[in-house]
């Protein structure tokens, strides 16, 4: 039950996280104009990974796409790549984890396969989350660097009365969305990996055991036996105790004096 809950929760958390990563990637507010030096501007600037926008006080917003690929900063391209990789891995992870969910039955899929799929999706979510966090952090670092550079150059080239105030940019909402979303995807991935351990059958110290009782011979098999997935102990079949009970490998059903009346 706990395994199913952990797996389900991991899936939901990852789903929210990936939705957030997609939202952050598409958002235009990766960097927003810093209004510290000009709080009374009627024109407000903000930029995303794909286009830059200008919002006027009148309510009108005008956006322009970055129609060049080669002319863009390498860092921006790197951030784009990290976010896209994060989305792709996350999407594949979601697809895999749907089939891995314990509550969903697909044909005669064994628990070992579900455990492997859960682990795979968990790893994918972790990498996806890390990609998003890395992408957002790289962009944030770029903003901080540019912010202080433009602050240093703020009033350079002042000729006479004319001020050319350089536009500075600060963190936009998309960065916070990206960080939170990446974190959620990461947490979801960890939860999936934890759930995988619970799904993986550990080989028990006993196999199916035949009890020879007086009366009819009854083969007793412990319920809920799981096939080995390679996780957990891999102990050889051992004789646990004598006295009529033998491991399945040793059982020989010879008729004894007690078998027939």
């Amino acid at each position: 039950m706990a395994v199913t809950a952990c797996q389900g929760l991991g899936f939901v958390v990852s789903l929210i996280g990936i939705a957030g990563i997609i939202a952050a990637t598409c958002m235009d507010q990766w960097s927003t104009q810093d209004l510290y030096n000009n709080p009374v501007t009627a024109v407000f600037n903000y930029q995303g990974l794909w286009r830059s926008c200008v919002r006027e006080s009148s309510g009108f917003t005008e956006c322009r796409g970055y129609f060049t690929l080669l002319g863009l900063p390498a860092m921006l391209q790197a951030v784009r790549a990290l976010m896209i990789v994060g989305i792709v891995l996350g999407a594949i992870g979601l697809l895999v984890s749907i089939f891995a969910l314990k509550c969903i039955r697909i044909g005669s899929m064994e628990d070992s396969a579900k455990a492997n799929m859960t682990l795979t999706s968990g790893i994918m979510f972790i990498v996806s989350g890390l990609c998003a966090i890395a992408g957002v952090s790289v962009f944030a670092n770029m903003l901080v660097t540019n912010f202080w550079m433009s602050t240093a150059n703020m009033y350079t080239g002042m000729g006479g009365m004319v001020q050319t105030v350089q536009t500075r940019y600060t963190f936009g909402a998309a960065l916070f969305v990206g960080w939170v979303a990446g974190g959620l995807t990461l947490i979801g991935g960890v939860m999936m990996c934890i759930a995988c351990r619970g799904l993986a059958p550990e080989e028990t110290n006993y196999k199916a055991v035949s009890y020879h009782a007086s009366g009819h011979s009854v083969a007793y098999k412990p319920g809920g036996f799981k096939a080995s997935t390679g996780f957990g102990s891999n102990t050889k079949n051992k004789k646990i105790y004598d006295g009529g009970a033998r491991t399945e490998d040793e059982v020989q059903s010879y008729p004894s004096k007690h078998d027939y009346v």
Epitope: T41, A42, V43, N45, Q47, V54, S58, G59, Q163
Partner: antibody, heavy 116, light 113 residues
Framework: QVQLKESGPGLVAPSQSLSITCTVS????????VHWVRQPPGKGLEWLGV???????NYESALMSRLSISKDNSKSQVFLKMNSLQTDDTAMYYC??????????WGQGTSVTVSS | DIVMTQSPSSLTVTAGEKVTMTCKSS????????????LTWYQQKPGQPPKLLIY???TRESGVPDRFTGSGSGTDFTLTISILQAEDLAVYYC?????????FGSGTKLEIK
């Protein structure tokens, strides 16, 4: 068609307050901002302030303490209220519609004289 | 506040001539995000309210004759009337609409000889 019409008291005593109403037609105040501009006799234009579609306002810094702009969207009316009037507030007061931060339609103006 | 300086303050010209007036702002009115200069030109004829002529420094308002041309970028702007007509007798104002308060220039008064 787009029209703006200012209506004011005409004569105001010094230290009293001024209230002017701008009634608009042909457009909605929920879609367009409205600016207030004044022009003292024989002088240039002076921007007073603006009220945006969302109701937020911006004012001329020197007049901010005694100027207030509000509106009633349902009545298509914009109100300008100015306190503590002095003789140098005597001017023609105009309201104008905003379009992408420029003023594309203007009212005919209302003359305000501050005198005892 | 941004200070708008217009020159000359008055101009007396003959009909048919080319007229040029300038407007300087104390800060750049160029928005890097959309490459627009937030400067507007108005024409005010005697006894009338101002009329929008040019916005974004160079975009002519619909219905405005093409003899009116706006140019310039950043802090220096120009309004040119290619062939002056008698009805162009007016005061011309430039206005900053980039940063609050939206300051006007003192105006250029155009008189016909």
């Amino acid at each position: 068609q787009v029209q703006l019409k200012e209506s004011g008291p005409g004569l105001v005593a010094p230290s009293q307050s001024l209230s002017i109403t701008c009634t608009v037609s042909g457009f909605s105040l929920t879609s367009y901002g409205v600016h207030w501009v004044r022009q003292p006799p024989g002088k240039g234009l002076e921007w007073l302030g603006v009220i945006w579609p969302g109701g937020n306002t911006n004012y001329e810094s020197a007049l901010m303490s005694r100027l207030s702009i509000s509106k009633d969207n349902s009545k298509s009316q914009v109100f300008l209220k100015m306190n503590s009037l002095q003789t140098d507030d005597t001017a023609m007061y105009y309201c104008a519609r905003d379009r992408r931060l420029a003023m594309d339609y203007w009212g005919q103006g209302t003359s305000v004289t501050v005198s005892s | 506040d941004i200070v708008m300086t217009q020159s000359p303050s008055s101009l007396t010209v003959t009909a048919g001539e080319k007229v040029t007036m300038t407007c300087k702002s104390s800060q750049s009115l160029l928005e890097s995000g959309n490459q627009k200069n937030y400067l507007t030109w108005y024409q005010q004829k005697p006894g009338q309210p101002p009329k929008l002529l040019i916005y974004w420094a160079s975009t002519r308002e619909s219905g405005v004759p093409d003899r009116f041309t706006g140019s310039g970028s950043g802090t220096d702007f120009t309004l040119t009337i290619s062939i002056l007509q008698a009805e162009d007798l007016a005061v011309y104002y430039c206005q900053n609409d980039y940063s609050y308060p939206f300051t006007f220039g003192s105006g250029t008064k155009l008189e016909i000889k």
